[in-house]
């Protein structure tokens, strides 16, 4: 279905195959201020009580081609003494993202949208739900 | 320049504006197995030592239209007794994702790629780097 009625300023496209054939400008627009981006620390992975590592996942037929994925370093969390705490678990926070995959493979101009589940970082959880008092 | 020599199976497109004008099939393919998707727990946000909430961010001129963003519940982390630990900070793990924005606004068939920084969850960090021993 067409999501929004077309106005005269919109390029024409067949409504019934709208979802299968949209035009996209892949020149990335940085809607983040460079200040916001530079303020975002990348050292949490070492300083966290549930530290993680990042591995490089590259697929030249995907946009973005390179995605860095998190893996938790330990099964347990690290306590204040730097020891593993066997009552607390280090778990991966995952996010579902959309990527573009070339279709057919190696064709530079046509893509399909695909969902991908990526690890973003780790957090420390207890086996019992607790609330701060 | 055309990135890959076009074969007859590839739809034609003008090489010199490759990035500005690609065709995308927006029918999302779920490349995640339903098992992988269903295994992904959503209760980490309550069980974490750095719990978070999720807020709904909706923009009809964006694809995906709805994005859930995390915010840390506390500035500090929650200890084993359920109290806030003033030596540990709860910090937001952010990820840069790509979204499609309608261009011009409200046109159903043309999009541009935009970067968006989203909060995915929270983790507990110390002010000193510690390593598990």
């Amino acid at each position: 279905a067409v999501l929004i009625p077309q106005s005269s300023v919109c390029p024409n496209a067949e409504a019934n195959n709208f979802l299968q054939n949209v035009k996209v400008n892949l020149k990335v627009i940085n809607s983040l201020s460079s200040k916001a981006s530079s303020r975002r620390p990348s050292d949490y992975l070492n300083r966290s009580t549930s530290p993680w590592t990042l591995s490089r996942n590259e697929d030249p037929d995907r946009y973005p081609s390179v995605i860095w994925e998190a893996q938790c370093r330990h099964q347990r969390c690290v306590n204040a003494e730097g020891k593993l705490d066997h009552h607390m678990n280090s778990v991966l926070i995952q996010q579902e993202i959309l990527v573009l995959k070339r279709e057919p493979e190696k064709c530079p101009f046509t893509f399909r949208v695909e969902k991908m589940l990526v690890g973003v970082g780790c957090t420390c959880v207890s086996s019992i739900v607790r609330h701060a008092s | 320049a055309v990135l890959i020599p076009q074969s007859s199976v590839c739809p034609n497109a003008e090489a010199n504006n490759f990035l500005q004008n690609v065709k995308v099939n927006l029918k999302v393919i779920n490349s995640l197995s339903s098992k992988a998707s269903s295994r992904r727990p959503s209760d980490y946000l309550n069980r974490s030592t750095s719990p978070w909430t999720l807020s709904r961010n909706e923009d009809p001129d964006r694809y995906p239209s709805v994005i859930w963003e995390a915010q840390c519940r506390h500035q500090r982390c929650v200890n084993a007794e359920g109290k806030l630990d003033h030596h540990m900070n709860s910090v937001l793990i952010q990820q840069e994702i790509l979204v499609l924005k309608r261009e011009p606004e409200k046109c159903p068939f043309t999009f541009r790629v935009e970067k968006m920084l989203v909060g995915v969850g929270c983790t507990c960090v110390s002010s000193i780097v510690r390593h598990a021993s």
Partner: antibody
Framework: EVQLVQSGAEVKKPGSSVKVSCKAS????????IHWVRQAPGQGLEWIGV????????FYNQKFDGRATLTADKSTSTAYMELSSLRSEDTAVYYC??????????????WGQGTTVTVSS | DIQLTQSPSSLSASVGDRVTITCSAS?????IYWFQQKPGKSPKRWIY???ELASGVPSRFSGSGSGTDYTLTISSLQPEDFATYYC?????????FGQGTKLEIK
């Protein structure tokens, strides 16, 4: 104009460390990874590893794992390569080069001018 | 590790000659990249994704190949083409380069 400007030449003793910087300008620093490549005198090119300024991720050629440390400072758009436990075989020109994260077909498109590191007792 | 073997290692040719440099990979790779380097200078990206000429590279250069065998061809050698050319793969870690082909004036 895209530029990768590296720090000056270094002379180091065996067993010591060296830290080479690579200051980027003319583009969005976090859209590109920084790869490091070295070239010993009269020899070919050797890939050391990659740092992603956006996430802080690093990946190394196993040959350098444990000795090389790649970092980046987003606030100054500067990448760093530190090499420890230097030996005479590490005498080389060290290059930084950028690599577009979104569309990897382009490969390593811009290179720094190189930093000569000489290891000698 | 994927080994890239360039041949010849060095080549003497005259202005106007047609020159072909080959790069053979020890395993199949998806794309090859070529860099040009002149003495005392940084490498320059010359051909990317096997076929594509980098910005400013003259059309007398071309790239081809697939699988394990790739070539860089110069249809009519010019004085400014005398340099060392390296092939490079990034299909498998660690990323590797060929040993280089030095193109000299005869």
């Amino acid at each position: 104009e895209v530029q990768l400007v590296q720090s000056g030449a270094e002379v180091k003793k065996p067993g010591s460390s060296v830290k080479v910087s690579c200051k980027a300008s003319g583009y969005t620093f976090t859209d590109y990874e920084i790869h490091w490549v070295r070239q010993a005198p009269g020899q070919g090119l050797e890939w050391i590893g990659v740092n992603d300024p956006e996430s802080g991720g690093t990946f190394y050629n196993q040959k350098f794992d444990g000795r090389a440390t790649l970092t980046a400072d987003k606030s100054t758009s500067t990448a760093y390569m530190e090499l420890s436990s230097l030996r005479s075989e590490d005498t080389a020109v060290y290059y930084c080069t950028r690599y577009y994260r979104y569309e990897s077909f382009y490969g390593m498109d811009y290179w720094g001018q190189g930093t000569t590191v000489t290891v000698s007792s | 590790d994927i080994q890239l073997t360039q041949s010849p290692s060095s080549l003497s040719a005259s202005v106007g000659d047609r020159v072909t440099i080959t790069c053979s990979a020890s395993s199949s790779i998806s794309y090859i990249y070529w860099f040009q380097q002149k003495p005392g200078k940084s490498p320059k990206r010359w051909i990317y994704a096997t076929f594509e000429l980098a910005s400013g590279v003259p059309s007398r250069f071309s790239g081809s190949g697939s699988g394990t065998d790739y070539t860089l061809t110069i249809s009519s050698l010019q004085p400014e083409d005398f340099a060392t050319y390296y092939c490079h793969q990034r299909s498998s870690y660690p990323w590797t380069f060929g040993q280089g082909t030095k193109l000299e004036i005869k």
